[in-house]
């Protein structure tokens, strides 16, 4: 018959306060004959949570079936977990004697904590846009946990990041904690799309690990770059030109037209389109009058992109002689 | 259903043998301390043998060298051999399975009579 | 040998009695006492292990108490049934020993 071993698989078992907790222990060897008992605590001290072979203990009920000759399992179910309850359980093995049963082997303990699951982390951007090729700070905090390891991770697309700060507060013992971390994140152009993620993994969370996220487009600015052009067929006695606006987010922006300094309200049609970055394109169309018109007109697209300063293009309008002298029905 | 049945018990004169049976049906023999119990007529009880789980044996004192527990585990069954029997033997014997962890008695047989007599 | 001594030895109790049966161990048994009760012609029937723990089948109305060396069965309320010799046995330790029995009879 092979020496009796107390196993005791957990070194800790974390538990949530009202929830039931189960204490494993198994034996390798039926003998010596004599019960099993659990206590918490270590020495003269120790507290008696259940015994196999008498007492009643209403919060305490065994996983197996004890009357069963062939049982080797003496692992056991606390109810109603308060945080008067944590400790160090023990499982340990009594030979029957008289006056009293001889302690004969005790498992290894397993320590109950209270545990508690981090809130969602909650990711913050920065308060103003940025543009790409500079560097954003992005917060994540969670609250609430327990015990206080825990493991923080910043990814960006899927890509785990680098440059961050993480702390857990407090430092000394309590019995909740809150983490807070800051990433520094460079900003590329095709950011709009992009997201960064925090994410929290503890062990209450069993493997499953909270995810807090932010999309990069709430703290990107891409900056348009402008295209001034002439189109070179003429309609009638107009020439049309196109300022075309590229790759730009946010959406906002206000274009206006000048000819020759003044003003124009007369922007004859515009479209926007998304790019497949998240970024937008928005091309407006000028039709300029010709007829009367002397050689050296200059138009100027300008915009303003997001509350930035504005930006603008000038066009000095070819007008040649042939185009002049275009009628407006002639047909090429 | 877990039960115990004795056989084997009988007449023998002074100085003989006998060899008790006790058949488990129910349960594993081998898994439980097992117990021989005897009971002279219109006397008390008397512990007589036992054999644990691990095969270790003892015996009472008025017995011990002339009586040998012993198992068959194939068989599922229990045996009492009882040598150099004497007078003082004759009583009904009772084969008891030994509890779960304390090895308190659970259940017993319905005995055999064993008679020493010339 | 651990010496268990039962009293008394007879009982003659009415249907509807409370009557207590005691057991005394030479030396200190812990709790490893059992109780039993044999009818005539009949096997013993296990009652009480640990001193006060029923097995199962067996109605309330039987319990046990005590520790060390000093037992007590008691019955609550006698029925027809009840009336038997009742055994206590001490099993801390080989030789198992039994008392001498306590025979209840009808009054």
């Known amino acids: 018959e092979e020496e009796l071993q107390m196993i005791q698989p957990e070194k800790l078992l974390l538990v949530t306060v009202g929830k039931t907790a189960t204490l494993h222990c198994t034996v390798t060897s039926l003998l010596p004959v004599g019960p099993v008992l659990w206590f918490r605590g270590v020495g003269p001290g120790r507290e008696l949570i259940y015994n196999q072979k008498e007492g009643h203990f209403p919060r305490v009920t065994t996983v197996s079936d004890l009357t069963k000759r062939n049982n080797m399992d003496f692992s056991i179910r606390i109810s109603s977990i308060t945080p008067a309850d944590v400790g160090t359980y023990y499982c340990v093995k009594f030979r029957k004697g008289s006056p009293d049963d001889v302690e004969f082997k005790s498992g290894p303990g397993t320590e109950m904590a209270l545990g508690a699951k981090p809130s969602a982390p909650v990711v913050l951007g920065p308060a103003a846009r940025t543009t790409p090729e500079h560097t954003v700070s992005f917060t994540c905090e969670s609250h609430g946990f327990s015990p206080r390891d825990i493991t923080l991770k910043w990814f960006k697309n899927g890509n785990e990041l680098s440059d961050f700060q993480t702390n857990v507060d407090p430092t000394g013992q309590s019995v909740a904690y809150s983490i807070r971390s800051t990433a520094r994140v460079v900003l590329d152009p095709w950011d709009v799309r992009s997201q960064v993620i925090c994410e929290v993994a503890h062990v209450t969370l069993q493997g499953d690990p909270l995810r807090g996220t932010a999309n990069l487009s709430e703290a990107i600015r891409v900056p348009p770059t402008l295209e001034v052009t002439q189109q070179p067929m003429r309609v009638g006695n107009q020439v049309n030109v196109t300022c075309q606006v590229r790759k730009f987010y946010p959406q906002s922006l206000q274009l206006t037209w000048s000819e020759n300094g003044n003003v124009c309200q007369r922007e004859t049609a515009s479209t926007l389109t998304e790019n497949k970055d998240g970024t937008y394109n928005w091309t407006s169309w000028f039709l300029v009058n010709i007829s009367d018109q002397r050689d050296d007109v200059v138009l100027t697209c300008q915009v303003k992109h997001d509350g930035q300063l504005a930006v603008s293009k000038r066009l000095a309008l070819e007008v040649t002689v042939h185009q002049k002298d275009q009628s407006s029905d002639a047909t090429p | 259903e877990v039960q115990l049945v004795e056989s084997g018990g009988g007449l023998v004169q002074p100085g003989g043998s006998l060899r008790l049976s006790c058949a488990a049906s129910g349960f594993t023999l081998s898994s439980y301390d097992m117990h021989w119990v005897r009971q002279a007529t219109g006397k008390g009880l008397e512990w007589v043998s036992a054999?644990?789980?691990?095969?270790?044996?003892y015996y009472t004192g008025s017995v011990k060298g002339r009586f040998t527990i012993s198992r068959e585990n194939a068989k599922n069954s229990l045996y009492l051999q009882m040598n150099s029997l004497r007078a003082a033997d004759t009583a009904v014997y009772y084969c008891v399975r030994g509890g779960v962890w304390d090895d308190a008695f659970d259940i017993w047989g319905q005995g055999t009579m064993v008679t020493v007599s010339s | 040998d651990i010496q268990m001594t039962q009293s008394p030895s007879s009982l003659s109790a009415s249907v509807g009695d409370r009557v207590t049966i005691t057991c005394r161990a030479s030396?200190?048994?812990?709790?490893?006492l059992a109780w039993f009760q044999q009818k005539p012609g009949k096997a013993p029937k296990s009652l009480i292990y640990t001193a006060s723990s029923l097995h199962s089948g067996v109605p309330s109305k039987f319990s046990g108490s005590g520790s060390g060396t000093d037992f007590t069965l008691t019955i609550s309320s006698l029925q027809p049934e009840d009336f038997a010799t009742y055994y206590c046995q001490q099993y801390v330790s080989y030789p198992y020993t039994f008392g001498q029995g306590t025979k209840l009879e009808i009054k």
């Open positions: 030396q200190d048994i812990n709790n490893y």
């Open positions: 054999i644990g789980t691990a095969g270790d044996t």
